[in-house]
Interface confidence: low
């Protein structure tokens, strides 16, 4: 059938120490997030249909001002990538919070059934869990 | 019929005092903006078909430098939300102009026929009306 | 046939002196970039099917810190536009790197067969060629 696979997720929590991944959640009971095709595996988004996808993300840092992002030696960085299967591991999209408190971007990329996407936030600042400030989604656009 | 509803709008003007909304306009006579399905109601975008939409926006502040955005106690913030009907009022997407002069983002969200989207710009700085710097659009992507 | 035209490009190189254009490349052999419908003409993206397109871009500056973007009198600016045919020349999307090192945005715009899109980066800073930091793409979304 025509691939309508689509998902929009909201932040659930950050990972334990040494785990830079953001953990996502989705579903109408949670608000305006949803999964229609893709699925969540321990908070990470797994693709179920091959194709080219538009991947988009916005992450806003909590307790943030331009000084809090600029005064760190190691800038806070957000990377979206395929983290499994290991043979397909790759960084798809990467941004740093220089003197800002929000990053937002999007890109087209081929994804395959079974690809699990990870969103790694490195640095000491915390992401906002407000649903209009931090979200992550994919949309199948063609085979 | 298959939902191809789509719109791309350009800024018309800001609201009067105490009205933080941006007022939009669209149509080929104005340039590269258009409405095909959605409609404008007093400068606000109204949805005419249920579905999941990709909502995107870029707003650039006029007469802006990184010092003008950082020196205000009240940061300039842009929020896109459903403002009517009141029962569905919600903030969908929110960004602050910390030390920057442009925000741009996008997200997938379910919208229903009759939902009116508002774009609220709070703060004392004015948005640019250049059509390549400030624009707002929606695209129906699936039922 | 139904228009599935789509492309995602990675940066090849910057132009020679006095040429602000970025030169792009795409194809599976290069990584995750591809052209399915549109084509490249000397590193510039040419549209082959009329329609409304979602145009998106992310550009990250190399060897960049918030001070390197803020200390220039003339801010580094990225503009995406139609550069040929000359009769249709127009700026579609424009952003400045104020105190940041990455810009990312997207917009819907009508494009016609034969339109060539140029991405002009003005300023003295160089863009990163990392494929997860700098990319440019278009997606046909409706007639």
């Amino acid at each position: 059938s025509l691939g309508w696979d689509i998902a929009e997720l909201q932040l659930n929590h950050t990972g334990p120490q040494q785990d830079p991944r953001l953990y996502w959640q989705g579903g109408p009971a949670l608000g305006r997030s949803f999964l229609r095709g893709p699925e969540l595996d321990k908070g990470q988004l797994r693709i179920r249909r091959d194709g080219i996808y538009m991947v988009h993300i916005q992450v806003t840092l909590a307790i943030c001002s331009s000084t809090s992002t600029s005064r760190h030696h190691h800038p806070t960085t957000l990377a979206v990538g395929i983290c499994s299967p290991a043979s397909r591991s790759i960084s798809l999209l990467r941004l740093s919070f220089h003197q800002g408190c929000t990053i937002a971007s999007q890109r087209l990329t081929p994804l395959a059934r079974g690809d699990t996407l990870c969103t790694n936030l490195t640095g000491t600042l915390l992401p906002s869990r407000n649903t209009d400030e931090t979200f992550f989604g994919v949309q199948w656009v063609r085979p | 019929s298959l939902g191809w509803d789509i719109a791309e709008l350009q800024l018309n003007h800001t609201g009067p005092q105490q009205d933080p909304r941006l007022y939009w306009q669209g149509g080929p006579a104005l340039g590269r903006s258009f409405l095909r399905g959605p409609e404008l109601d007093k400068g606000q975008l109204r949805i005419r078909r249920d579905g999941i939409y990709m909502v995107h926006i870029q707003v650039t502040l006029a007469i802006c430098s990184s010092t003008s955005t950082s020196r205000h106690h009240h940061p300039t913030t842009l929020a896109v939300g459903i403002c009517s009907p009141a029962s569905r009022s919600i903030s969908l997407l929110r960004l602050s102009f910390h030390q920057g002069c442009t925000i741009a983002s996008q997200r997938l969200t379910p919208l229903a026929r009759g939902d009116t989207l508002c774009t609220n710009l709070t703060g004392t700085l004015l948005p640019s009306r250049n059509t390549d710097e400030t624009f707002f659009g929606v695209q129906w992507v699936r039922p | 046939s139904l228009g599935w035209d789509i492309a995602e490009l990675q940066l090849n190189h910057t132009g020679p002196q006095q040429d602000p254009r970025l030169y792009w490349q795409g194809g599976p052999a290069l990584g995750r970039s591809f052209l399915r419908g549109p084509e490249l003409d000397k590193g510039q993206l040419r549209i082959r099917r009329d329609g409304i397109y979602m145009v998106h871009i992310q550009v990250t500056l190399a060897i960049c810190s918030s001070t390197s973007t803020s200390r220039h009198h003339h801010p580094t600016t990225l503009a995406v536009g139609i550069c040929s045919p000359a009769s249709r020349s127009i700026s579609l999307l424009r952003l400045s790197f104020h105190q940041g090192c990455t810009i990312a945005s997207q917009r819907l715009t009508p494009l016609a067969r034969g339109d060539t899109l140029c991405t002009n980066l003005t300023g003295t800073l160089l863009p990163s060629r990392n494929t997860d930091e700098t990319f440019f793409g278009v997606q046909w979304v409706r007639p």
Epitope: H13, D19, G31, L126, T131 | - | -
Partner: antibody, heavy 131, light 118 residues
């Protein structure tokens, strides 16, 4: 450095309305990511959250005090005010104002917040309810 | 509304470590809650110590020594405040506070009085 200072009458008669102001210096009460709370502490007892006002003026109240509590603000004075109506001797307490980090957003029937921590407190003002 | 239980009092010797608990009532999983901790000395307002949601979602108050740390004990459905290298100046009342993302009603525990012996 953010500083908060409570002010108001030390003695209020039963059935009257208690009004306390909190003046903030070193930061604006309209700054995003903060909201502004009132907390009280009866003699020899623990802390009780009464309510808060957000950076955009939204108000939140403790369910047990909701019918008697009102919080407002005057941005020109950088001040927020607590009003507690129909007071009784049980309302005798030290009243604190505090800044809270963690902006609240209301979405789809639920409140979401980034953090919830009372990071700056006033010195407190003693209020006695007695005839 | 969550009910938080703290032991009314506890005591420990200087230099030792102490663990203060903040137990949520049944039906409220500690994993879903943000917990913040406050110290109050006699005659003074409370002071913010730290906030804890998970090991990487936490925040230490300005000027608060690293001797103070937070954690959770899911088996006891409790938030924990750990104080190591106990000092005489740590003698105070300690309060926990929680709020979860389904409501906005911050609740404080009843407080624990910590006595430093000797």
């Amino acid at each position: 450095q953010v500083q908060l200072q409570e002010s108001g009458p030390g003695l209020v008669k039963p059935s009257q309305t208690l009004s306390l102001a909190c003046t903030v210096s070193g930061g604006s009460i309209t700054t995003s990511y903060y909201y502004w709370s009132w907390i009280r502490q009866p003699p020899g007892k623990g802390l009780e959250w009464m309510g808060a006002i957000g950076s955009r003026g939204s108000t939140y109240y403790s369910p047990s005090l909701k019918t008697r509590t009102s919080i407002s603000r005057d941005t020109s004075k950088n001040q927020f005010t607590l009003q507690l109506s129909s007071v009784t001797p049980e309302d005798t307490a030290v009243y604190y104002c505090a800044r809270v980090t963690g902006e609240i957003t209301y979405n789809s029937g639920s409140y979401y917040y980034t953090l919830n921590l009372f990071d700056y407190w006033g010195q407190g003002t003693q209020v006695t309810v007695s005839s | 509304q969550s009910v938080l239980t703290q032991p009314p009092s506890l005591s420990a010797s200087p230099g030792s470590s102490v663990r203060l608990t903040c137990t949520l009532s049944s039906g409220n999983s500690v994993g879903n809650y943000d917990i913040s901790w406050y110290q109050q000395k006699a005659g003074s307002p409370p002071r913010y110590l730290l906030y804890y949601y998970s090991d990487s979602y936490k925040n230490q108050g300005s000027g608060v020594p690293s001797r103070f740390s937070g954690s959770k004990d899911p088996s006891a459905n409790a938030g924990l405040l750990l104080i190591s290298g106990l000092q005489a100046e740590d003698e105070a009342d300690y309060y926990c506070s929680v709020s979860n993302s389904g409501t906005y009603k911050p609740v404080f525990g009843g407080g624990s009085k910590l006595t430093v012996l000797g």
